[in-house]
């Protein structure tokens, strides 16, 4: 049994780190493998993660962790029974992938404006809470040529779009993702998309 692609891990900077790797051949990850992890810290204990399959040769493990601080460093050992397949380390603060924003809602009852709101995925006491900026992707299922990214660089999880900039009488979809500039994170996954119908019509005089 051999590791083809070594485990690569990212932390959500809250309670979970996700490690993914590929094996040299088809593997029943949960039956054959264990990922052991231990914080490099006085009197810490070894904890075990049971991986799941992620495609034929891929495995993924969700490591439960405490709140992340910059000093945290974990040793990782990938075992197949009594055989040590791989040994490495992981510093969560240096490999952060934020959680995806949630509760994306579109408000179309605001005059001349489409208002999009969503929720910050972190509690106020988390360091990432005040560091997230967002990208909102809006596209049309009726007009494949229309797709826009709006960068939200302010803290408030809202975006206002003049309804007049969207075509009337067609449906749009939106999704949002986040990243934290000061923590040099990757982008989060996209939130689930939400759909709305743009019924806005310009006043008669402006037509």
């Amino acid at each position: 049994m051999k590791v083809l692609q070594e485990p690569a891990c990212v932390s959500d900077y809250m309670s979970i780190s996700t490690c993914e790797w590929k094996m040299g051949g088809p593997t029943n990850c949960s039956a054959e493998l264990r990922l052991l992890y231990q914080l490099v810290f006085q009197s810490s204990e070894t904890h075990t993660c049971v991986p799941e399959n992620n495609g034929g040769v891929g495995c993924v493990c969700h490591l439960l962790m405490d709140d992340v601080v910059s000093m945290d460093n974990y040793t990782l050992d990938l075992w197949a029974g009594q055989q040590l397949l791989w040994k490495g380390s992981f510093k969560p603060s240096e490999h952060v992938k934020p959680r995806a924003p949630g509760n994306l809602t579109v408000h179309t009852n605001v005059s001349d404006t489409v208002l999009l709101t969503w929720s910050n995925p972190y509690p106020p006491d988390n360091y990432l809470y005040n560091d997230l900026t967002y990208a909102v992707n809006i596209w049309s299922e009726n007009d494949p040529a229309y797709s826009r990214i709006h960068n939200v660089t302010y803290l408030k999880p809202t975006l206002r779009i003049p309804a007049s900039t969207l075509k009337s009488g067609i449906s749009y979809r939106a999704r949002v993702r986040a990243w934290a500039q000061h923590y040099n994170t990757t982008w989060s996954e996209w939130s689930p998309s939400t759909k709305w119908y743009n019924s806005y019509r310009e006043p008669f005089e402006q037509r």
């Epitope: 006085q42 962790m65 601080v69």
Partner: antibody, heavy 125, light 112 residues
Framework: EVQLVESGGGLEQPGGSLRLSCAGS????????MTWVRQAPGKGLEWVSS????????YYADSVKGRFTISRDNSKNTLYLQMNSLRAEDTAVYYC??????????????????WGQGTTVTVSS | DIVMTQSPLSLPVTPGEPASISCRSS???????????VDWYLQKSGQSPQLLIY???KRASGVPDRFSGSGSGTDFTLKISRVEAEDVGFYYC?????????FGQGTKLEIK
């Protein structure tokens, strides 16, 4: 009531061996790291050894490394210190103390918040 | 190894007066914000040590509020706002950041 009771001290000749025990009660013993601290007559406190709650990680002072072994039996709620190749400078009162909660991912520290009454070890010919 | 240096080694105090003991570590014992791995212990004559302060400034259960701890990184202080006769004994700081744990030399507090 949270309590630690040491036993096993006594008089031993240089080069001899002793095994100290520390019985814990009133708390979930296996969840906590444990520590041994000693105090030579008229001297200050000296850390000797620590062990994680699951017994998987052990730590020793340089002065006892290779001679002393810390262990625990969580089924008996008991901590041990096996002392071999004893020297005159090992003469001291030995205390066990409850250390950090080590079953969490990052051990939670509340100080050495419970101490035993101490057991006296005298090494002399 | 981290070295813990305590001062003064002897502290005569009048009852009702404040007292202060300093402890300096040879390297930082700060793991993360608010988590300085320094404790303060009191050992009264003929007794086992008892915990007063942990993590630099957190008062242990049952410890009177006249005891307080402060400091961060490498410099720490134990303060007694009004010394009482029962406070006599040896005071030790200890770093629990990493093994080997190290105690300071001890400060003998006595009543004038």
């Amino acid at each position: 009531e949270v309590q630690l009771v040491e036993s096993g001290g006594g008089l031993e000749q240089p080069g001899g061996s002793l095994r100290l025990s520390c019985a814990g009660s009133g708390f979930t013993f296996r969840d906590f790291a444990m520590t041994w601290v000693r105090q030579a007559p008229g001297k200050g406190l000296e850390w000797v050894s620590s062990v994680s709650g699951d017994g998987g990680n052990t730590y020793y002072a340089d002065s006892v490394k290779g001679r002393f072994t810390i262990s625990r039996d969580n089924s008996k709620n008991t901590l041990y210190l096996q002392m071999n190749s004893l020297r005159a400078e090992d003469t001291a009162v030995y205390y066990c103390a409850k250390d950090r909660l080590s079953k969490t991912i990052r051990p939670r520290y509340y100080g050495l918040d419970v101490w035993g009454q101490g057991t006296t070890v005298t090494v002399s010919s | 190894d981290i070295v813990m240096t305590q001062s003064p080694l002897s502290l005569p105090v009048t009852p009702g007066e404040p007292a202060s003991i300093s402890c300096r570590s040879s390297q930082s014992v700060l793991y993360s914000i608010g988590y300085n791995y320094v404790d303060w212990y009191l050992q009264k004559s003929g007794q086992s040590p008892q915990l007063l302060i942990y993590l630099g400034n957190k008062r242990a259960s049952g410890v009177p509020d006249r005891f307080s701890g402060s400091g961060s990184g490498t410099d720490f202080t134990l303060k007694i706002s009004r010394v009482e006769a029962e406070d006599v004994g040896f005071y030790y700081c200890m770093q629990a950041y990493q093994s080997p744990y190290v105690f300071g030399q001890g400060t003998k507090l006595e009543i004038k």
